[in-house]
């Protein structure tokens, strides 16, 4: 028993009119000694469960039950865990920024899409907020790989994404094919002018037959890109 409230330890309370340090009653606490009252302990119930139980000197600490996460200072509320395509921030669940994904349910942060070009591979399927990009097999590059910069969420951070190398390679291949066919057409036209006796049948029929035979080789590159039908010259 002391005669001054100033000397009281945490876990006690003391009234000025009767300066005696008294222990806090059950389910109450005081982290500072000499206060006229002890504080009521926090109860963790419902979506909350105890992280730390209350003692005479410290309040209880709560955390959220499985499937929920804390929000606010000292875990004042519980919010349902994030879905795939989201990540937790102070404000709660936020959709992944452009160029990032999260395929996990309830946990994890948004991470960048795989940079396929690091392994010399092309992008087969572009990514979403829930799924990473799908990289194709290694490609023989027809042109130097190009990069574009996407500025996520309007922030200054830039996310380096490889441009679809496969698309560029196919475009280059098709262009070359078109140039070759055009040249071939011109050469045939010149030969027809120079040596008309070679062409007994009309020219159109000959090229038509050639096109029919070659329809497959003409359509194959398009089919790879999901297109259909042959080229018409």
């Amino acid at each position: 028993v002391q005669n001054s409230c100033d000397n009281c330890q945490p876990g006690t309370f003391c009234r000025k009119y009767n300066p005696v340090c008294k222990s806090c009653p059950p389910s109450t606490f005081s982290s500072i000694g000499g206060q006229p009252n002890c504080n009521i302990c926090r109860v963790c119930a419902g979506y909350f469960r105890f992280k730390k139980f209350c003692s005479s000197t410290h309040n209880a600490e709560c955390e959220c039950i499985e499937g929920f996460h804390c929000l606010g200072p000292q875990c004042t509320r519980c919010e349902k865990d994030c879905r795939p395509g989201q990540e937790l921030t102070k404000q709660g669940c936020k959709t992944c920024s452009l160029g990032t994904f999260n395929d996990q349910n309830g946990t994890g942060v948004c991470r960048p899409w795989t940079n396929c070009s690091l392994d010399g591979r092309s992008v087969l399927k572009t990514g979403t907020t829930e799924k990473d990009v799908v990289c194709g097999p290694p490609v023989v590059s027809f042109s130097p790989s190009t990069t574009i910069s996407v500025t996520p969420e309007g922030g200054p951070g830039g996310h380096s994404l490889q441009v679809l190398t496969l698309f560029l390679a196919l475009t280059s291949a098709l262009l070359l094919a078109l140039i070759f066919i055009t040249l071939l057409f011109s050469v045939l036209k010149w030969i027809r002018k120079k040596f008309p006796h070679i062409f007994k049948q009309p020219f159109k029929k000959t090229t038509g037959a050639a096109q029919e035979e070659d329809a497959c080789s003409c359509r194959c590159p398009q089919e790879e890109e999901g297109g259909g039908g042959g080229y018409e010259l």
Epitope: P73, Q74, E87, L88, T89, K90, Q91, K94, S97, G99, T100, T107, G108, V109, C110, R111, P112, W113, T114, N115, L118, D132, P152, E153, G154, G155, P156, G157, H159, S160
Partner: antibody, heavy 121, light 111 residues
Framework: EVQLVQSGAEVKKPGSSVKVSCKAS????????IYWVRQAPGQGLEWIGN????????FYGEKFMGRATFTADTSTSTAYMELSSLRSEDTAVYYC??????????????WGQGTLVTVSS | NVMLTQPHSVSESPGKTVTISCKLN????????VHWYQQRPGSSPTTMIY?????PDGVPDRFSGSIDSSSNSASLTISGLKTEDEADYYC??????????FGGGTKLTVL
């Protein structure tokens, strides 16, 4: 025990490149972001960019885009930062730091010891 | 551009309390977590406060963090100042979850 150990100090000529390494241990290297931050003499902390070692995905600060390149070697749990076209203003201590995977706006819980890069002719 | 502004320096006597502010110039201070790092000369930064008001294990309870929405700023308060608290202190938050932002740093001098 989680540790990030960086390579030693470097002295470089203007226009050249420097490659700083950051070897991680004590945790799953592929499951946490590695951030790169620099501090010029007597100045504050400046974000350069970050890498997700799990797939090599990167983010770069606008100021460093095109000059900084991040890579990660998962076999040795080492992250690398290469900075090209060096100029005297790039003289700084370069830090790597790890961010926990709790939230997208989380703190950096572990830092490397720093690598001093001096750019001088 | 999002900026966090800190006082260049603060000083106080041992045993006293000091508060370092970190003001966000645009946006809402409540949008993203604020973290505080201590950096002693020649050393790497170490976390003193994370996620606005949480203390890592080993950091004394003399250190506390808070958010004030009315002034759009965060604060680091150190009570019972000790000479070993003399260091640079940096606040850290985000402009987006991809873009971290640091305050300019505050040099704390314990007189």
């Amino acid at each position: 025990e989680v540790q990030l150990v960086q390579s030693g100090a470097e002295v470089k000529k203007p226009g050249s490149s420097v490659k700083v390494s950051c070897k991680a241990s004590g945790y799953t290297f592929t499951s946490y972001y590695i951030y790169w931050v620099r501090q010029a003499p007597g100045q504050g902390l400046e974000w350069i960019g970050n890498i997700w070692p799990g797939n090599g995905g990167t983010f770069y600060g606008e100021k460093f885009m095109g000059r900084a390149t991040f890579t990660a070697d998962t076999s040795t749990s080492t992250a690398y930062m290469e900075l090209s076209s060096l100029r005297s203003e790039d003289t700084a201590v370069y830090y790597c730091a790890r961010r926990p995977d709790y939230s997208g706006d989380d703190y950096f819980d572990y830092w490397g010891q720093g690598t001093l890069v001096t750019v001088s002719s | 551009n999002v900026m966090l502004t800190q006082p260049h320096s603060v000083s106080e006597s041992p045993g006293k309390t000091v508060t370092i502010s970190c003001k966000l110039n645009s946006g809402n201070i409540g949008s993203y977590y604020v973290h505080w790092y201590q950096q002693r000369p020649g050393s790497s930064p170490t976390t003193m406060i994370y996620r606005d008001d949480k203390r890592p294990d080993g950091v004394p309870d003399r250190f506390s963090g808070s958010i004030d929405s009315s002034s759009n700023s965060a604060s680091l308060t150190i009570s019972g100042l000790k000479t070993e608290d003399e260091a640079d202190y940096y606040c850290h938050s985000y402009d987006s979850t991809i873009t971290p932002v640091f305050g300019g740093g505050t040099k704390l001098t314990v007189l």
